[in-house]
């Protein structure tokens, strides 16, 4: 039993960022005369939070009128709580004097601030990679409290397991950040695939935040090349077709070479999309056989997405009879397709 007890009934209070926090404090006696002050933290470095007598504390208001006769309730309300307000708050009774003498402190109330994590931001690799290669995606979310948080990765709805996650800082802090890296093995079918970073936290009340990244930003599907000749027309012209299939992204340049000399260059644009998100493109070249004495070597050269050129060559025989053209032509591949 004591002459004066300073009662802080709550050991801890948890408040959502932006809300108000009520810190309760009552005293068992108003004697001896002296003020009540609120501090955050203990010891010489403690921070004055509220003092009725003097000072300007715009975010702090007393719950009861402190000037009311026989008031023994010195609870305060702190508005617009931020993670920086977290800490242990002490209600302290002073005995009037010159200066006032600290008489008794309450047991303290720990204020923890529940702050929502920021929307997860997912970033992919800086350069594209091809199928069978592994790429890394990073997910970051900041400003949450308390520290406990769950982060999961999904690819097309399936949870990924090759994941490394860190929450910083490791020690006590007003707020925390999470950074996670997921490693994904690409396939040719991933143009339409999506990775999702899902963050669950107590402040989100079961409705996790999601960040997404499209694998279309990370993948390159190299084209297949095929060069074919249509039957010779009556006007001694041969139609040679270069079929470029199953490539992504669309950025592609095709060059025709006749006997090593550039005949025509084309850029792919506004191509229709295949079901799997890849593109096809067909280019043809008319060769006037009668204008050539010797066989014509045609090359379809494709530069895809800034990668080294891929060539496919075809020889048009001009020495044979037109009717026999189909059986006397020979195709020659001078490049290798990326698969």
């Amino acid at each position: 039993e004591e002459e004066l007890q300073v009662i802080q009934p709550e050991k801890s209070v948890s408040v959502a960022a932006g809300d108000s926090a009520t810190l309760n404090c009552t005293v068992s006696s108003l004697i001896p005369v002296g003020p009540i002050q609120w501090f955050r933290g203990a010891g010489p470095g403690r921070e004055l939070i509220y003092n009725l007598k003097e000072g300007h504390f715009p975010r702090v208001t007393p719950v009861s009128d402190p000037t009311k006769r026989n008031n023994m309730d010195f609870s305060i309300r702190i508005s617009n709580i931020t993670p920086a307000d977290a800490g242990t708050y002490y209600c302290v009774k002073f005995r009037k004097g010159s200066p006032d003498v600290e008489l008794k402190s309450g047991a303290g109330t720990e204020l923890s601030v529940r702050a929502k994590p920021s929307a997860p931001v997912v970033s992919g690799p800086a350069v594209r990679a091809t199928a069978e290669h592994t790429v890394s995606f990073t997910c970051e979310s900041h400003g949450f409290s308390p520290r406990d948080i769950t982060l999961k990765w999904f690819k097309n709805g399936n949870e990924l397991s090759d994941v490394q996650t860190n929450v910083d800082p490791a020690g006590k802090s007003v707020s925390y950040s999470i950074r996670s890296t997921a490693r994904v093995v690409l396939t040719r079918r991933d143009v339409h695939s999506q990775v999702i970073c899902e963050v669950a936290h107590v402040t989100l009340q079961g409705d996790p935040l999601r960040g997404t990244a499209n694998l279309s930003e990370a993948i390159r599907v190299p084209p297949f090349l095929e060069v074919t000749q249509q039957s010779m027309r009556a006007d001694n012209q041969v139609n040679v077709t270069c079929q470029v299939t199953k490539f992504y992204p669309q950025r592609l340049q095709l060059t025709w070479l006749e006997n090593g000399n550039v005949s025509r260059t084309e850029m792919a644009s506004a191509l229709p999309e295949n079901k799997d998100g890849t593109y096809n493109w067909t280019s043809w070249l008319l060769v006037n056989v009668s204008a050539h004495r010797d066989d014509v070597k045609l090359t379809c050269q494709v530069e895809h997405d800034g990668q080294p050129a891929v060539n496919k060559s075809f020889s048009v025989k001009v020495s044979a009879h037109p009717k026999e053209q189909g059986s006397n032509t020979a195709a020659e591949n001078t490049g290798t397709n990326e698969r």
Epitope: E1, E3, S29, L30, P32, V33, G34, I36, T67, K68
Partner: antibody, heavy 114, light 111 residues
Framework: EVQLEESGPGLVAPSQSLSITCTVS????????VNWVRQPPGKGLEWLGI???????DYNSALKSRLSISKDNSKSQVFLKMNSLQSDDTARYYC????????WGQGTSVTVSS | DIVLTQSPASLAVSLGQGATISCRAS??????????MHWYQQKPGQPPKPLIY???NLESGVPARFSGSGSRTDFTLTIDPVEADDAATYYC?????????FGGGTKLEIK
């Protein structure tokens, strides 16, 4: 039950010092302050000083130079020492609990006389 | 020092009537919304007995016939109705500023 009991010499010669003990029960001296108050015969009450639960003291400025209040928490005793007594220090000396003075001892009578 | 002046110095009241004792402080005894003024009753050969604390709060065990009022510098103790057992000397006391001081006392006589 809260009780306070003063014990003193009864008679003190002029210019000598006075020592009074207040023995308390029913409460702890670490949790409560104890006051000393005196009352000359047929006159009013005069506050002398207080020793708080933490051991700090406050005195009546008019008597501060002659007064000393101390305590022994383990023995539940509070001590009043007053120097250079004169005849006008003749009074009944009381100890009373806390800033509220809610419990009083019966007092001990001190006469300053040769 | 805060000087407390009680009036009257003595008064005689008939049994069953009301008695009013005044205490005036030389400066305010209010702090932090409260008046640090208290009232005590003392009978001959006995120590003072607390009646009222913080100007208007009744100590436990004290009959409701006793009441206190006032703020800042002017305070009143009222006993209504008085009983024979109320014959005593009444003191006001402040503990807002050091040194704590008592009023000179008011002697109540029952007629």
């Amino acid at each position: 039950e809260v009780q306070l009991e003063e014990s003193g010499p009864g008679l003190v010669a002029p210019s000598q010092s006075l020592s009074i003990t207040c023995t308390v029960s029913g409460f702890s001296l670490t949790g409560y302050g104890v006051n000393w108050v005196r009352q000359p015969p047929g006159k009013g009450l005069e506050w002398l000083g207080i020793i708080w639960g933490d051991g700090s003291t406050d005195y009546n400025s008019a008597l501060k130079s002659r007064l000393s209040i101390s305590k022994d928490n383990s023995k539940s005793q509070v001590f009043l020492k007053m120097n250079s007594l004169q005849s006008d220090d003749t009074a009944r000396y009381y100890c009373a609990r806390a800033g509220k003075m809610d419990y009083w001892g019966q007092g001990t009578s001190v006469t300053v006389s040769s | 020092d805060i000087v407390l002046t009680q009036s009257p110095a003595s008064l005689a009241v008939s049994l069953g009537q009301g008695a009013t004792i005044s205490c005036r402080a030389s400066e305010s005894v209010d702090s932090y919304g409260n008046s640090f003024m208290h009232w005590y009753q003392q009978k001959p050969g006995q120590p003072p007995k607390p009646l009222i604390y913080l100007a208007s709060n009744l100590e436990s065990g004290v009959p409701a016939r006793f009441s206190g009022s006032g703020s800042r510098t002017d305070f009143t103790l009222t006993i209504d109705p008085v009983e024979a057992d109320d014959a005593a000397t009444y003191y006001c006391q402040q503990n807002n500023e050091y040194p704590w001081t008592f009023g000179g006392g008011t002697k109540l006589e029952i007629k």
